[in-house]
């Protein structure tokens, strides 16, 4: 089943997020992803946990998953590089770099997103955009078109409270509010964008969605700049 969903959001403006990727398994949407270089998509390591025998591909330039669109193209994956410290039972280091079989054809609907390299927390209250093709309600309805939602960043101390994530939020993670509007499992690997810059990647740990006491958890890309650079080099 797809890992993730946008709850309480709305349909995104078509192709206004040209960095947005759909990581697909055997032709079906599995996770979100973000184009960070011409031949590289960043996603979440847990997305490929159950994909050992399947064919992993990356869809770029899409708004609708099913309808033909001139900018849409499906790329094979040459190499999948999960973060070496990612583990199935933790949310830490939940990053994955996917090398496309060839450089993406860039255009208005396909464009890499600048990512944050300065290792400094986003200020609490900052509104950030998260997008994905995950299910849109608790009944499990899957959207065909890209959805998005604006979420305020939550301070780490609040996120670390016992009734929230009880100390699990390290300096390499960040949180966003989850009061009815939220990202969740299937949006995993998708981008959290603040001020036009990629700040976080949706983690793919199991988590109740849309409950304000269980904020969304995002991997801070700035904290992994050295690793990303080393893989892309």
């Amino acid at each position: 089943p797809p890992r993730g969903r946008i709850l309480g959001g709305r349909e995104a403006e078509a192709h206004a997020r040209p960095y947005m990727a759909s990581v697909q398994l055997n032709g079906a949407h599995l996770c979100g992803g973000v184009l960070v270089a011409e031949q590289w998509v960043l996603s979440a390591a847990h997305c490929l946990e159950d994909a050992a025998d399947g064919k992993v591909q990356v869809l770029l330039g899409a708004h609708s998953l099913s309808q033909p669109e001139p900018s849409k193209r499906l790329y094979d994956v040459l190499r999948a590089v999960p973060h070496p410290d990612s583990q199935p039972d933790t949310i830490d280091h939940d990053l994955l770099l996917l090398q496309l079989s060839e450089k993406a054809t860039l255009g208005p609907a396909v464009r890499p997103l600048p990512w944050q390299r300065v290792d400094r927390d986003v200020a609490p209250g900052t509104l950030c955009d998260v997008a994905g093709w995950g299910i849109v309600n608790h009944a499990g309805r899957r959207p065909d078109s890209l959805q998005h939602v604006l979420l305020p960043v939550l301070d780490r101390a609040t996120c670390n409270r016992r009734t929230h994530h009880d100390g699990a939020i390290t300096e390499r993670l960040m949180c966003a509010e989850s009061n009815r509007r939220d990202s969740c499992k299937g949006d995993s690997g998708g981008p959290l964008v603040c001020g036009g810059v990629l700040e976080g990647v949706v983690t793919s740990g199991s988590r109740v969605c849309g409950n304000r006491k269980k904020p969304g958890i995002y991997t801070r890309v700035a904290s992994y700049a050295a690793w990303i650079d080393s893989v892309l080099a």
């Epitope: 670390n160 100390g167 939020i169 300096e171």
Partner: antibody, heavy 116, light 112 residues
């Protein structure tokens, strides 16, 4: 290693105030709430209140409103609790504890004795 | 406030014995998020409390597996399968689901 170092014992007169401190080390101070507890001699623990070190937001046990005031100094990674209008009933050991995970990390306690 | 009642007040045991401590709340301590924030702490003489169990049954890192927690709703139990000398002290249950958080009155585990 996470450590919470509390200030030393205090002997204070009835009606006076006292400010005790809890200096954090081994982690980023602003990443976790600080909670305060009271333990009278031979008794159980009582939760006084908590503070978010990012913005100073506080929550108090109704029982301690007007008695305790919680503050932080981010520059020195220190949390403070001021107790005012002290009486013999306030004689106790006061603990700070980091919240997350649970109350896994506690200060060593500060003994406050109120005596004429 | 949620009242946490522990029994017994004192528990004399022989080393190697099993020990059980009960903790009852006067209302459910299931949080609105669905979790139950029931914890157990051990306070040895002259020391600060130490976290043993969180969310009813989860052992904190480094806590020996002879400690186990169980229960739901309003009725909770801490079990020590084989008491060792280092386990002696006062055990407190704690609920963090409702404000203000509250501790039980304590159970003193001592040598028979």
């Amino acid at each position: 290693e996470v450590q919470l170092q509390q200030s030393g014992p205090e002997l204070v007169k009835p009606g006076a105030s006292v400010k005790i401190s809890c200096k954090a080390s081994g982690y980023t101070f602003t990443d976790y709430y600080k909670n305060w507890m009271r333990q009278r001699h031979g008794e159980s623990l009582e939760w006084i209140g908590d503070i978010n070190p990012n913005n100073g937001d506080t929550s108090y046990n109704q029982k301690f409103r007007g008695k305790a005031t919680l503050t932080v100094d981010k520059s020195s990674s220190t949390a403070f609790m001021e107790l005012r209008s002290l009486t013999s009933e306030d004689s106790a050991v006061y603990y700070c504890a980091r919240e997350g995970p649970s109350f896994a990390y506690w200060g060593q306690g500060t003994l406050v004795t109120v005596s004429a | 406030d949620v009242l946490m009642t522990q029994t017994p007040l004192s528990l004399p045991v022989s080393l190697g014995d099993q020990a059980s401590i009960s903790c009852r709340s006067n209302q459910t301590i299931v949080h609105s998020n669905g979790d139950t924030y029931l914890e157990w702490y051990l306070q040895k003489p002259g020391q600060s409390p130490n976290l043993l169990i969180y969310k009813v049954s989860n052992r904190f890192s480094g806590v020996p597996d002879r400690f186990s927690g169980s229960g739901s709703g309003t009725d909770f139990t801490l079990r020590i399968s084989r008491v060792e000398a280092e386990d002696l002290g006062v055990y407190y249950c704690f609920q963090g689901s409702h404000v203000p958080p509250t501790f039980g009155g304590g159970t003193k585990l001592e040598i028979k």
